[in-house]
């Protein structure tokens, strides 16, 4: 009875176990009892990344600049092209088929993690003692100014969006304090 299974780098065809084509090559003709599987290398902009019996190679991915994409790693006959996004943009999916602008952190929020080609900006609310007064994709929350270290006093309290306002100490109060 004919075989029903083949080894891993073989495939069953016409009761024969034929050798699969190596990565980077496509199938031209199946083996016979007396001839080996015939394979041909993929073309310039094509690839196959597994042992296979494909009659056509896959086209390399096109990194469309109109979608904010650029080539991160050029494809070979055995690997697909890897796209990433232009500076200031990140991929919308794992496959990186299109890009969106990095989000900015609004006033009152600072950048916890700067965006990469594949991940968006991560913002965090500025905790007490810190502020951010700009909308930015890079700025972290800044600590309030320490008036004391400048020999000044707080004239206006800080918020998560504004720094404290420092002012000179009252000379009279300062004088009485020392007597």
């Amino acid at each position: 009875e004919p075989p029903t299974a083949c080894r891993e780098k073989q495939y069953l065809i016409n009761s024969q176990c034929c050798s699969l084509c190596q990565p980077g090559q496509k199938l031209v003709s199946d083996c016979t009892e007396f001839t080996e599987t015939e394979c041909l290398p993929c073309g310039e902009s094509e690839f196959l990344d597994t042992w296979n019996r494909e009659t056509h190679c896959h086209q390399h991915k096109y990194c469309d600049p109109n979608l904010g994409l650029r080539v991160q790693q050029k494809g070979t006959s055995e690997t697909d092209t890897i796209c990433t996004c232009e500076e200031g943009w990140h991929c919308t999916s794992e496959a990186c088929e299109s890009c969106v602008l990095h989000r900015s952190c609004s006033p009152g929020f600072g950048v916890k993690q700067i965006a990469t080609g594949v991940s968006d900006t991560i913002c965090e609310p500025c905790p007490v003692g810190f502020f951010s007064n700009v909308s930015s994709a890079f700025e972290k929350c800044h600590p309030w100014t320490s008036c004391e270290t400048k020999d000044l006093v707080v004239q206006q309290a800080g918020t998560n969006k504004t720094d404290v306002v420092c002012g000179p100490q009252d000379r009279l109060r300062h004088h009485h304090h020392h007597h």
Epitope: R7, Q22, T35
Partner: antibody, heavy 127, light 107 residues
Amino acid sequence: EVQLLESGGGLVRPGGSLRLSCAASGFTFGSYEMNWVRQAPGKGLEWVSYISSSGETTDYADSVKGRFTVSRDNSKNLLYLQMNSLRAEDTAVYYCARDVFFFDSSGPRGAYGMDVWGQGTMVTVSS
Amino acid sequence: DIQLTQSPSSLTASVGDRVTITCRSSQGIRSSLAWYQQKPGKPPKLLIYGASSLEGGVPSRFSGSGSGTDFTLTISSLQPEDFATYYCQQLNSFPSTFGQGTKLEIK
């Protein structure tokens, strides 16, 4: 060192069962296809069974089909042969052997061979 | 199933002799043939794969040839350690099969 070590052989009555084990070491067991091959006393080699690297595909010699089951545990680097309904003609030294795919990109299409063998375990089926 | 027939079944030769063992397949198997050497009480040892490729560490006096249905194993100059039994095996399709063996004895 690349090694295969069979165990579980012994004397069993006709109709009885036995489970052989083959412990692999020195290589990434889960990446290789494996086989069981036996040799009756004073006779030649007889291929018994095959299992793919994942365990998904198996095949057997007609003489053992329906009675023997090959399996593997890649997490433990172990290959098994469950032998049921044993007969006197199953008496043999049982070897586990590693299938290897030799590939030279300049060559035609690559080729298989059994490059690593265990020392064997004796199974005797007798009343 | 594919049958493999080895000839001769046994062979007597002397050290230094050139020896040829043949293996004929009942159907075409391209180059999907391996040759093994086995000594008493030991497991087989792979010599040749893909009909003609020498396994690493095997002396170059061993060579294989053939394709389709007819294959040969040649030992160019027999050494004392070569006296053993030799088997061909087809790995073309399941069930995998072995030849019946050729016992090479010292004259």
